[in-house]
Amino acid sequence: QHTCSISKVTSLLEVNCENKKLTALPADLPADTGILHLGENQLGTFSTASLVHFTHLTYLYLDRCELTSLQTNGKLIKLENLDLSHNNLKSLPSLGWALPALTTLDVSFNKLGSLSPGVLDGLSQLQELYLQNNDLKSLPPGLLLPTTKLKKLNLANNKLRELPSGLLDGLEDLDTLYLQRNWLRTIPKGFFGTLLLPFVFLHANSWYCDCEILYFRHWLQENANNVYLWKQGVDVKDTTPNVASVRCANLDNAPVYSYPGKGCPTSSGDTDYDDYDDIPDVPATRTEVKFSTNTKVHTTHWSLLAAAPSTSQDSQMISLPPTHKPTKKQSTFIHTQSPGFTTLPETMESNPTFYSLKLNTVLIPSPTTLEPTSTQATPEPNIQPMLTTSTLTTPEHSTTPVPTTTILTTPEHSTIPVPTTAILTTPKPSTIPVPTTATLTTLEPSTTPVPTTATLTTPEPSTTLVPTTATLTTPEHSTTPVPTTATLTTPEHSTTPVPTTATLTTPEPSTTLTNLVSTISPVLTTTLTTPESTPIETILEQFFTTELTLLPTLESTTTIIPEQNSFLNLPEVALVSSDTSESSPFLNSDFCCFLP
């Protein structure tokens, strides 16, 4: 019999040599070992060269082996999981050449004082990195640049005083970040970028609350639902968020998220966010676009936060408590009327696919009741918006286009947001935000608005199409009018042209955030409901075949909004794919939306 016990797990031969008082690798290890447990032995040093002939080796456990040095002088081409935890390693050699397939690396509970800049070079498959409970005082810039697939990063229980500002750059898959129990005083501006991190642990640090903490404070406010207090032996999914666990060491342990920041400058340069301090407690809208195709999944969200100028944003942030568990893979951008320039990231693979588009617009009304009506009301100053709804269903074999326009008119001085899926005309001063299904562009400060273009190309053998409506509202005091173009191209052999409507209105001075709404749909259903005591809800479902071409990502000051904030869970557009062999028109998403 072997010194070590042998079994098999998921087709891998598992050899367990734990706690056998070994000082070296056993001589009788099976050549086809796939999982090797060498933990709790007295190996002292270990060389990967000793395992190069084990060509099936996928998991290697070297925990609690009293290791003081590791040599990566032999290539283990299949090794995916390496456990070096609970040893005495003071440094790590470069691992990429020897372990190119590594997905999980655990070097926790060692004596690492620092890491060399290229220690992770070549670890392109790494998904989990555990460095907790070491003596790390700093991290080299670019440490994680090679590990673009990283999902879990644990840096807890170290002596980190600061973090490199670009540490998380490019880590789009990161979902869990442990930074608790370090000596951190602040978080660099822009540190989290546009990442949505469902699980973050930040407690037990030396957070110093002064004006430098404002970026971090705002991030905590926006991600309150994703900040947790770590408890030993408790799965994070079984705990509740605890943003208050992040406390100011210099202010009687007051929560960082509620730090008032009195006297601090409020320009976006100071916070790496748009200026939130001048936005009142008013209803907010949020539009999200989620793309997922039958190829590699990518998800992109936009958000709009629109409000009239007022005093402070702090109270609003606190008044929007998160309620749900986080959802992964959702990058969400918030924009206000402050400058910034954002387009959809150029991350989606362009692939002709069948999509289902669902637009869900929910606007939170002021404390008033809304009654739908189909009659035109006199535009007197009142607080009841008049809602006119229309429902269109195009039968399968119809060969005649059915033009439809849903027009919602809000009376003067209304402060109630009204959802729309077609044309929205806002007379006189108003604070009505409008969702968009196209690409969102926020301009730098300029007196010249940007033109808006919507282009739709329909497939060749098309028999029925529904009109495309593009609406743009420009504030009166724009010094240059904004040309709006809605261009529809119907290729040869299409039996029916598609009517296109482009409406341009220029109301009185307004702080309304208004965006192009473009609908492209052979089958269009618009439903407007106003149940008692619930937000107005508009649902638009579209099915179309398309190839998506996205604008390049431009430099942007953006921030993340927690996906799960129930008060901000507003318009949502979901593009969900399914396989199809139908012909595919091309939807060019180079629409842009003017933000006054």
Epitope: I6, S7, V9, T10, D32, T33, E80
Partner: antibody, heavy 118, light 113 residues
């Protein structure tokens, strides 16, 4: 076609030994993991031992230390050496082939009966 | 060890009618690395050795009629026979091939009514 033929079964007293053989044909024997599975009279199936194509054996606790699986690739033969036999080892012993590195059994022999009785 | 529990233990069937056998494991048989469930089904006809029907939960062995199908994930699995034929009688076993020791269910005896 794949064929597995077991032999060596019989009646044996408790505490004694027996060696089963399985002659394989119709496939490249050395490339496949092989196993022994038994079935007590009127009962279900129970895995007894396996050996990888590289010759690594592994067992359930019930036979560990008593049974030894081995193979002779030059003879295309699988063996099961059974020592310290007990009454509860009475069963039909099947030789079975595993699919590649996986551990389901795609071909079975007709079985050989081992009876442990005093 | 992973315990496999089958039900029912006896299943009287009518030819041409569908039949279904359940198999539950005491722990998940899903391998997160490849998203495969490591479960196989065998039929042992009277007086014969077992024959492989299905592996990895739903992959039919070559030569097995398409009236046999497997489904399930994690700990709950099902073998379905869409239209039972007389030759389908025997004892059906599920087996987990997730981790050794490989274990079988106690068997379900399918017989014609």
């Amino acid at each position: 076609q794949v064929q597995l033929v077991e032999s060596g079964g019989g009646v044996v007293q408790p505490g004694r030994s027996l060696r089963l053989s399985c002659a394989a044909s119709g496939f490249t024997f050395s490339s496949f993991a092989m196993s022994w599975v038994r079935q007590a009279p009127g009962k279900g199936l129970e895995w007894v031992a396996s050996i990888t194509s590289a010759g690594t054996p592994y067992y359930p606790d019930s036979v560990l230390g008593r049974f030894t699986i081995s193979r002779d690739n030059s003879k295309n033969t699988l063996y099961l050496q059974m020592n310290s036999l007990r009454a509860e080892d009475t069963a039909v012993y099947y030789c079975a082939r595993s699919r590649g590195y996986e551990d389901y059994f795609d071909y079975w022999g007709q079985g050989t009966l081992v009876t442990v009785s005093s | 060890d992973i315990v496999m529990t089958q039900s029912p233990l006896s299943l009287p069937v009518t030819p041409g009618e569908p039949a279904s056998i359940s198999c539950k494991s005491s722990q998940s048989l899903l391998n997160s690395r490849n998203q495969k469930n490591y479960l196989a089904w065998y039929l042992q006809k009277p007086g014969q050795s077992p024959q492989l029907l299905i592996y990895f939960t739903s992959t039919r062995e070559s030569g097995v009629p398409d009236r046999f199908s497997g489904s399930g994930s994690g700990t709950d699995f099902t073998l379905k026979i869409s239209r039972v034929e007389a030759e389908d009688v025997g004892v059906y076993y599920c087996q987990q091939h997730y981790s050794s020791p490989w274990t079988f269910g106690q068997g379900t005896k399918v017989e014609i009514k």
